[in-house]
Interface confidence: low
Amino acid sequence: RTVPPMVNVTRSEASEGNITVTCRASGFYPWNITLSWRQDGVSLSHDTQQWGDVLPDGNGTYQTWVATRICQGEEQRFTCYMEHSGNHSTHPVPSGKVLVLQSHW
C-alpha cells in the first residue's frame, strides 16, 4: 500500500533578520521519503539543513521534517521539495506574519 504524505510548511522567528522555515510531512507510507529545501530551484547544501528522524505517528504511517534558516524577506525564493513513492511536489514558504515558535536549531 502507498499513502501519500500531507506536507505543511511553517515559519518561526530564529534571530534578528532570520527565520527558520520547517517543512513537515506526515501520514505517509512506506517510510521512505525525501524532503529537501531549495533556493531558486537549487537544492541547498545538506549541511545547511536539519532533518528530523522518520517516526511512526501511531496510525500505521510516518512523519518527518526538514528545517533551514533563511533571511527574512527572502521567503519567496525558498521551496520544500518532497519525493515519495514516485510522486513529487513543491511547497512554498507561506507569506504573512512570522509566528514566534520554538526553533529546531
Epitope: P30, N32, T34, S45, H46, E83, H84, G86, N87, H88
Partner: antibody, heavy 119, light 108 residues
Framework: QVQLQESGPGLVKPSETLSLTCTVS????????VHWIRQPPGKGLEWIGM???????DYNAAFISRVTISVDTSKNQFSLKLSSVTAADTAVYYC?????????????WGQGTLVTVSS | EIVLTQSPGTLSLSPGERATLSCTAS???????LHWYQQKPGQAPRLLIY???NLASGIPDRFSGSGSGTDFTLTISRLEPEDFAVYYC?????????FGQGTKLEIK
C-alpha cells in the same frame, strides 16, 4: 526489470564536448532521478551530478562550469554533456538511479562506458 | 570538501573469516547520508548499505553497517567467495559529494 545503459563515443578530442546518453527501462523517468558518476582507469569514483524527477539539476562544483544533465522523457533517456574536455576526463562514465527514500543513494547502475580523451 | 579515508587500503582474508572495513570522514556526516557500495572487476558498483546501516534490496544479512559522526564501519560476518571485491563508502551530506578511495578485499 530495471536497466540503465550508457552510450556515446568512446573517443573525444581535447577541448571538445563529451556527450553521453543513459537509456533506461523498467522504471519511469518522471518518478526517479538519475546520477552521473565517473571512474578514471584504476582509480576511485567521482560524483558528477544528478537530475531530480522534476528536472532540477544538482552538480558537483568541480564540474559546474562545463556540465549539463538533462532528460528526454519521450526517448526514455538522460544525457550528460561535459565541455572543454582534457585527458583528465578519461574515465568510465556511469549513470545510476536515485533510489526512493534511499537518501540519494544509487540503487541501480548502468554497466558504464569508457570515454578516452585523446587527439 | 569532506574527505573520506578508508582503511585498510587492502584487506587479505580467507573465506569464512570476519571482515571489518573502516571509513573516516574529515568532518561530521549525517548517518542518513553515508552509503556503502561494492565493486567487482569490470563491473559497475552496486549499492550495499544505505544510510549507514540499512541493507539494500537483495543484499545478504552477513553484511552490516554501523557508525556515526566521522567514523563508520562495514562488517561482513562470514566471508563468502563472492564477497572479494572493492568497497567504497560515499557521503551525500555536503557538496561536493564524495567517495572514499576504496578498500580492496582480497583472498588470502
Amino acid at each position: 526489470q530495471v536497466q540503465l545503459q550508457e552510450s556515446g563515443p568512446g573517443l573525444v578530442k581535447p577541448s571538445e564536448t563529451l556527450s553521453l546518453t543513459c537509456t533506461v527501462s523498467g522504471f519511469s523517468l518522471t518518478t526517479y532521478g538519475v546520477h552521473w558518476i565517473r571512474q578514471p582507469p584504476g582509480k576511485g569514483l567521482e560524483w558528477i551530478g544528478m537530475i531530480w524527477t522534476d528536472g532540477t539539476t544538482d552538480y558537483n562544483a568541480a564540474f559546474i562550469s562545463r556540465v549539463t544533465i538533462s532528460v528526454d522523457t519521450s526517448k526514455n533517456q538522460f544525457s550528460l554533456k561535459l565541455s572543454s574536455v582534457t585527458a583528465a576526463d578519461t574515465a568510465v562514465y556511469y549513470c545510476a538511479r536515485k533510489g526512493h527514500g534511499y537518501y540519494y543513494a544509487m540503487d541501480y547502475w548502468g554497466q558504464g562506458t569508457l570515454v578516452t580523451v585523446s587527439s | 570538501e569532506i574527505v573520506l579515508t578508508q582503511s585498510p587500503g587492502t584487506l587479505s582474508l580467507s573465506p569464512g573469516e570476519r571482515a571489518t572495513l573502516s571509513c573516516t570522514a574529515s568532518s561530521s556526516v549525517s548517518s542518513s547520508y553515508l552509503h556503502w557500495y561494492q565493486q567487482k572487476p569490470g563491473q559497475a558498483p552496486r549499492l550495499l548499505i544505505y544510510s549507514t546501516s540499512n541493507l539494500a534490496s537483495g543484499i545478504p544479512d552477513r553484511f552490516s553497517g554501523s557508525g556515526s559522526g566521522t567514523d563508520f564501519t562495514l562488517t561482513i560476518s562470514r566471508l563468502e567467495p563472492e564477497d572479494f571485491a572493492v568497497y567504497y563508502c560515499h557521503q551525500y551530506h555536503r557538496s561536493p559529494f564524495t567517495f572514499g578511495q576504496g578498500t580492496k578485499l582480497e583472498i588470502k
